[in-house]
């Protein structure tokens, strides 16, 4: 059980959230960092990914309402599929319908995540801040 | 030992944060919670001690570097003394200096806090939306 | 309601320096990008200088770039652009303006007036 | 640095639509924006990404593209949009600066 190094007991009337990857915050058990370095879509993709993260998927207003007081935009993890014109996440599933309000800024196909459950489309090579989520299980 | 009701391993890679308020942001083992409805600073700080906790109080640019992404304006826990014209915390302590750029945008006493690090001067009975926040152990 | 005024225009001569001045309310300025856009008299508009709203990253024209430079006080909400090595050519209105996303303006200022002029 | 190139001038009948175009091989990446400007006052943009509206724009407005050109399009023309209309883009050889195109002054007749 080398891995393992703490054994804590938790209030009833508080809890505690997590586990989150060091100074990460952590709200209703997912885990979020914003990222300040400017990066394009891949480079984010693979930023996250090397943290055991992902870029940011936004599943459910309730859930994640703290999205909603974000400011400037950041890459998310949303991704238009020309194929078939759908947008889906990183993991494959569809962008759920009346989540997010999708503004086509520009020529792309990929979204920047915007306050108050905005997607911006934008070209995936332009350099923007990004935001990694980690699901806790 | 009845409050006591849960027993976690903590994998050394990553941590809990908290304890905090069931629903609330843990970051850096602060909790916070950004309240919607709008209210004056003293109905504001009442709501928050309602809930075993204080208005915003800012005391580090890195331990709360999450406030930096914050839009809006919201009431925190700083009013002015005017028999000294210092700002001070709800606990007591003076505001230290560089931790906040103070814009007077109003005639008042009470201090909304703005995106990166700022503070708005505001009549303390405008009604606001406001951050609640409870330091852990 | 947004409000962007500019000041700090006037008459100077070739190779004199000016600085303009924008005081913005009615928003949360730090959270947003900012651009300086000329006009020439009787001319079309020209992008001039853009600096995002913590004021780490400044962009320039290439016509103005070394003599140009952008800059902002976030505390006292205002922007700022201070015009060295001034020509001719750069005799134009002055507008500031706040940036809806990149490139996209949302919020102009009435102008000032430079006129470079011996 | 790009270019983008517009007529210098149209005219339109009242009531009637109108089409302003835009020209540049920056256009071919990016969507343009556009600002009315009227005499003796700033500009105010109208038209920005694919086609979207600011708050206050009447719907009469529109924008589309095709290829490397930007199209402005005032459907039932009313005699307050007489203006100059100015397109704008990001520069095709760095994203961080952007051009306007020469402007195009609209009569409405």
């Known amino acids: 059980n080398s891995l393992f190094n703490q054994e804590v007991q938790i209030p009833l009337t508080e809890s505690y959230c997590g586990p989150c990857p060091k100074n990460w915050i952590c709200y209703k058990n997912n885990c979020y960092q914003f990222f300040d370095e400017s990066k394009n879509w891949y480079e984010s993709q693979a930023s996250c990914m090397s943290q055991n993260a992902s870029l940011l998927k936004v599943y459910s207003k309730e859930d994640q309402d703290l999205l909603k007081l974000v400011k400037s935009y950041h890459w998310m993890g949303l991704v238009h599929i020309p194929t078939n014109g759908s947008w889906q996440w990183e993991d494959g599933s569809i962008l759920s319908p009346n989540l997010l309000t999708i503004i086509e800024m520009q020529k792309g196909d990929c979204a920047l995540y915007a306050s108050s459950f905005k997607g911006y489309i934008e070209n995936c090579s332009t350099p923007n801040t990004y935001i990694c989520m980690q699901r806790t299980v | 030992n009845s409050l006591f009701n849960q027993e976690v391993q903590i994998p050394l890679t990553e941590s809990y944060c908290g304890p905090c308020p069931k629903n609330w942001i843990c970051y850096k083992n602060n909790c916070y919670q950004f309240f919607d409805e709008s209210k004056n600073w003293y109905e504001s700080q009442a709501s928050c001690m309602s809930q075993n906790a204080s208005l915003l109080k800012v005391y580090s640019k890195e331990d709360q570097d999450l406030l930096k992404l914050v839009k809006s304006y919201h009431w925190m826990g700083l009013v002015h003394i005017p028999t000294n014209g210092s700002w001070q915390w709800e606990d007591g302590s003076i505001l230290s200096p560089n931790l906040l750029t103070i814009i007077e945008m109003q005639k008042g006493d009470c201090a909304l806090y703005a995106s990166s690090f700022k503070g708005y001067i505001e009549n303390c009975s405008t009604p606001n939306t406001y951050i609640c926040m409870q330091r852990t152990v | 309601e947004v409000q962007l005024l500019e000041s700090g225009g006037g008459l100077v001569q070739p190779g004199g320096s000016l600085r303009l001045s924008c005081a913005a309310s009615g928003f949360t300025f730090s959270s947003y990008a900012m651009s300086w856009v000329r006009q020439a008299p009787g001319k079309g508009l020209e992008w001039v200088s853009a600096?995002?709203?913590?004021?780490?990253?400044?962009y320039y024209a290439d016509s103005v770039k070394g003599r140009f430079t952008i800059s902002r006080d976030n505390s006292k909400n205002t922007l700022y652009l201070q015009m060295n090595s001034l020509r001719a050519e750069d005799t134009a209105v002055y507008y500031c303006a706040k940036e809806l996303y990149r490139e996209y303006m949302d919020y102009w200022g009435q102008g000032t007036l430079v006129t470079v002029s011996s | 640095s790009s270019e983008l190139t517009q007529d210098p001038a149209v005219s339109v009948a009242l009531g009637q639509t109108v089409r302003i175009t835009c020209q540049g091989d920056?256009?071919?990446?990016?969507?343009a924006s556009w600002y009315q400007q009227k005499p003796g006052q700033a500009p105010v943009l109208v038209i920005y990404?694919?086609?979207n509206r600011p708050s206050g724009i009447p719907d009469r407005f529109s924008g589309s593209s095709s290829g490397n050109t930007a199209s402005l399009t005032i459907t039932g023309a009313q005699a307050e949009d007489e203006a100059d209309y100015y397109c704008n883009s990001r520069d095709s050889f760095s994203i961080h600066q952007n051009v306007f195109g020469g402007g195009t002054k609209l009569t409405v007749l």
């Open positions: 600096i995002s709203g913590s004021g780490g990253s400044t």
């Open positions: 990404g694919k086609n």
């Open positions: 920056s256009l071919r990446s990016y969507y």
